[in-house]
């Protein structure tokens, strides 16, 4: 209407996807009758008439609106359900009487994108790249209006820079309406970028005010070549024979290069290359003292064939040698002495210790062992260990039996053996002496020997119970060069008053054993040695 | 609209080199990253190697050794060169066009056959 | 290396009916996983990418789902022009194919 004031800004409602608009006519009592107006959508500058207000009943008009229009508040809102981003114009009322005004209505539509999903370079990023490289993707799907995109490398936020870092955004339109936004950050990366956490932040708004979504945080694989080489030994600390070392080639390359690992010949004064396993790892199990030497790795780049050397590392592989003992296997007539001496090598200080085989009990703590005044207790094994107290489990025995010259010494004297008639008896005899004795027996049986150990020797016999065996009972006679001994096995016949509830018939009937513990003869005790435990 | 076309030789005897070509329209190298993919009669897709819209080269490692991939920005072509090829080579060899990360469009494919 | 497991290996179903295609990866990969049509001497065909987004003229009635390890391609009425080997691929670290899942009409 010419000479008309220019226009008033529209009022503007901000309603969220999906939600219902409520589109109130502004239009004061003056300006027109709220019981006759019209309702018109603006799009591109044209006008549709979308709802009819007569006395106060409401009535849509066919086209998009038609099955989304009602009437609230006594007929001055319109209510537009079910809000969509096309929706997203100018609406207008223009009452009737007494003068044709209207009020206009700006619809603002939003909707929050959906979490950013962000995708790393799956091939990553070389540093020496001659232009910015795809580092990652952001993409925030059905947003509306278009959701803003920022970066973040390790919390701040990374700003373009010519030739370092692009930031390259795009949009595409839904059937919905909604944007899905992508992002590509690319950037040319340097090695400390190794660990950089990067992310994305979407920033849009919704009628509550301004809000933001965070992606999850990536990192990148770089690509840098190789500036320092070195090795590694496993375990750390002291090496012993025996143990598993594994020597592992390291480089602050990435990706790795190939490795190969050498050790010097201190003969030929050159380098022999060592056998690596797949991942370059050089495995010496169970290292020998041979194995001690210095080691070095080369590291090859395969793109460029340029090698790096590592330092060299020395390792040591301590060890101990076989133990020797002097004499080696001594023999002593009662009452006489024995000096033991035991040596060793090492690569280390080393410590001697002297242990009675029978009880491990600590005789003495240094390389020589002397013994006096020998017993025939004396007798048995004695052994050395040669050990490096720096460190433990690394240490070699040597065992020598020392023999001492006497006449037979039986394991019982006399024993009485629970039997039945007509049974096979089995009987055992058991001797010690040096020579070593034999055994016989004075009836007619089965027999068998086997010798203990070079002293003392074990006798078993299979023999039938008859009656004059059960009259006489059985003899066994040990004898060596120095004199004979003899044990006696006295048979009892089983009655029924004999046998307790808690005896053990099968041993009771057909075994009679000798333990080298129950022995029955005369006993002295020496120095350096345990006290006995009482026998007979 | 976007293409790619593979071309190189049908038939390579065993220990040649293979040379393949890919040669692109409807889009810049130095945009777009591209890959080369194999199938062997009737077996799944294998990826071999990419070069990056920067120029960086990317290899599967278990043909390292054997691979070279380059471009020619000017002719719109990505190379690929195989040596040392094995009757187990034979394959169908694919070209495709990186977006950014996944592989939205591929060339029809050329069969090399790796036989004496 | 990432491997990608496929199954079944091979299907066999009606026309209408809905088909499910599992891709199982050997590590979390999030959603960085593409699916592929291939028909018969022909060329690989994008169909799915980002797991769920659909690639612009693909029909509606494909859709894929999942992230983490477990990702599934569905096809909601299958056609007779869908007869193809369908191919999972991940692109979290490097790029690795499923070993194909034949799809064919009873």
């Known amino acids: 209407v010419p000479g008309e004031a220019e226009q008033p800004a529209p009022e503007l409602v901000e309603v969220e996807v999906g939600s219902t608009a409520l589109l109130k006519c502004g239009l004061s009592q003056s300006q027109g009758n709220l019981s006759h107006v019209d309702w018109f959508s603006v799009h591109k500058e044209k006008r549709t008439l979308i709802f009819r207000v007569r006395q106060g009943q409401g009535q849509s008009e066919p086209g998009e609106y038609e099955q989304r229009l009602s009437l609230q508040d006594r007929g001055a809102t319109l209510a537009l359900t079910q809000v969509t981003p096309q929706d997203e114009r100018i609406f207008l009322c223009q009452g009737k009487r007494p003068r044709s005004q209207e009020y206009r209505i700006q619809l603002r539509v939003y909707k929050a994108p959906e979490e950013p999903n962000i995708q790393v370079n799956p091939l990553g990023i070389p540093v020496n790249s001659k232009e910015p490289e795809e580092v990652a993707t952001c993409v925030g799907r059905n947003g509306y209006p278009i959701p803003q995109v920022i970066w973040y490398k390790n919390g701040r936020p990374l700003k373009e820079e010519k030739n370092r870092v692009h930031i390259q955004s795009s949009q595409t339109v839904e059937s919905s309406g909604l944007y899905t936004l992508q992002s590509i950050l690319k950037a040319q990366l340097v090695k400390e970028d190794k660990d950089a956490q990067f992310y994305c932040e979407l920033n849009y708004r919704l009628p509550s005010g301004n809000h933001m979504k965070e992606s999850r945080e990536v990192t990148v694989p770089v690509f840098y070549p190789t500036e320092k080489v070195w090795l590694e030994v496993e375990p750390v600390g002291m090496l012993k024979e025996g143990d598993r070392v594994e020597i592992r080639c390291l480089a602050d390359g990435n990706p790795p290069p190939h490795f190969s690992i050498s050790k010097g010949n201190p003969s030929t004064r050159e380098a022999e290359e060592e056998t690596t396993n797949d991942n370059g790892v050089l495995v010496l199990e169970p290292a020998r003292k041979e194995h001690s030497g210095r080691y070095e790795c080369q590291a090859w780049n395969l793109d460029t064939m340029i090698s790096l050397l590592s330092e060299p590392q020395e390792l040591l592989v301590n060890y101990v040698s076989d133990v020797r003992v002097s004499p080696a296997a001594p023999e002593r007539q009662e009452g006489s002495s024995l000096t033991l001496t035991c040596e060793a090598e090492s690569s280390q200080d080393l410590e001697f210790q002297w242990l009675r085989e029978e009880t491990d009990q600590v005789l003495e703590r240094g390389p020589v062992l002397q013994l006096h005044d020998l017993k025939r207790e004396a007798g048995g094994g004695y052994r050395c260990v040669a050990s490096v107290p720096s460190i433990p489990g690394l240490n070699r025995t040597q065992l020598v039996k020392l023999a001492i010259f006497g006449p037979p010494w039986m394991a019982f004297k006399e024993r009485k053996v629970w039997v039945k008639e007509n049974m096979v008896l089995n009987l055992s005899c058991e001797a010690s002496g040096h020579p070593r004795p034999t055994i016989s027996w004075n009836v007619n049986g089965t027999a068998s020997e086997g010798d203990q150990d070079p002293q003392r020797v074990l006798s078993t016999l299979n023999v039938l119970v008859t009656p004059e065996l059960l009259e006489t009972g059985v003899e066994c006679t040990a004898s060596n060069d120095l004199g004979k001994n003899t044990s006696i096995l006295f048979l009892e016949l089983v009655n029924l008053t004999t046998l307790t509830p808690d005896s053990n018939t099968t041993t009771g009937l057909s075994t009679s054993t000798a333990s080298p513990h129950t022995r029955a003869n005369s006993t002295s005790t020496e120095r350096k040695l345990p006290e006995p435990e009482s026998r007979g | 609209q976007v293409t790619l076309k593979e071309s190189g030789p049908v038939l390579v005897k065993p220990t040649e080199t293979l040379t393949l070509t890919c040669t692109v329209s409807?889009?810049?190298?130095?945009?777009?990253?591209v890959s080369w993919v194999r199938q062997p009669p009737g077996k799944a897709l294998e990826w071999i190697a990419a070069?990056?819209?920067?120029?960086?080269?990317y290899y599967n490692s278990a043909f390292k050794s054997r691979l070279t991939i380059s471009r020619d920005t000017s002719k719109s072509q990505v190379v690929l060169t195989m040596t040392n090829m094995d009757p187990v080579d034979t394959a169908t060899y694919y070209c495709?066009?990186?977006?950014?990360?996944?592989?939205?469009?591929w060339g029809q494919g050329t069969l090399v056959t790796v036989s004496s | 290396d990432i491997q990608m497991t496929q199954s079944p290996s091979s299907l066999s179903a009606s026309v209408g009916d809905r088909v499910t295609i599992n891709c199982k990866g050997s590590?979390?990969?999030?959603?960085?996983l593409a699916w592929f049509q291939q028909k018969p001497g022909k060329v690989p065909k994008l169909l799915i990418y980002?797991?769920?987004s659909l690639q612009t003229g693909i029909p509606s009635r494909f859709s894929g789902s999942g992230s983490g390890t477990d990702f599934t391609l569905t096809i909601s009425s299958l056609q007779p022009e869908d007869v193809a080997t369908y191919y999972c691929?991940?692109?979290?670290?490097?790029?690795?194919f499923g070993g194909g899942t034949k799809v064919e009409i009873k």
């Open positions: 070069i990056s819209s920067g120029g960086s080269t």
């Open positions: 590590q979390n990969i999030y959603k960085s």
């Open positions: 409807g889009f810049s190298l130095t945009s777009n990253a």
């Open positions: 980002d797991a769920n």
């Open positions: 495709a066009r990186h977006r950014p990360f996944y592989f939205d469009y």
């Open positions: 691929q991940q692109y979290y670290s490097g790029y690795t």
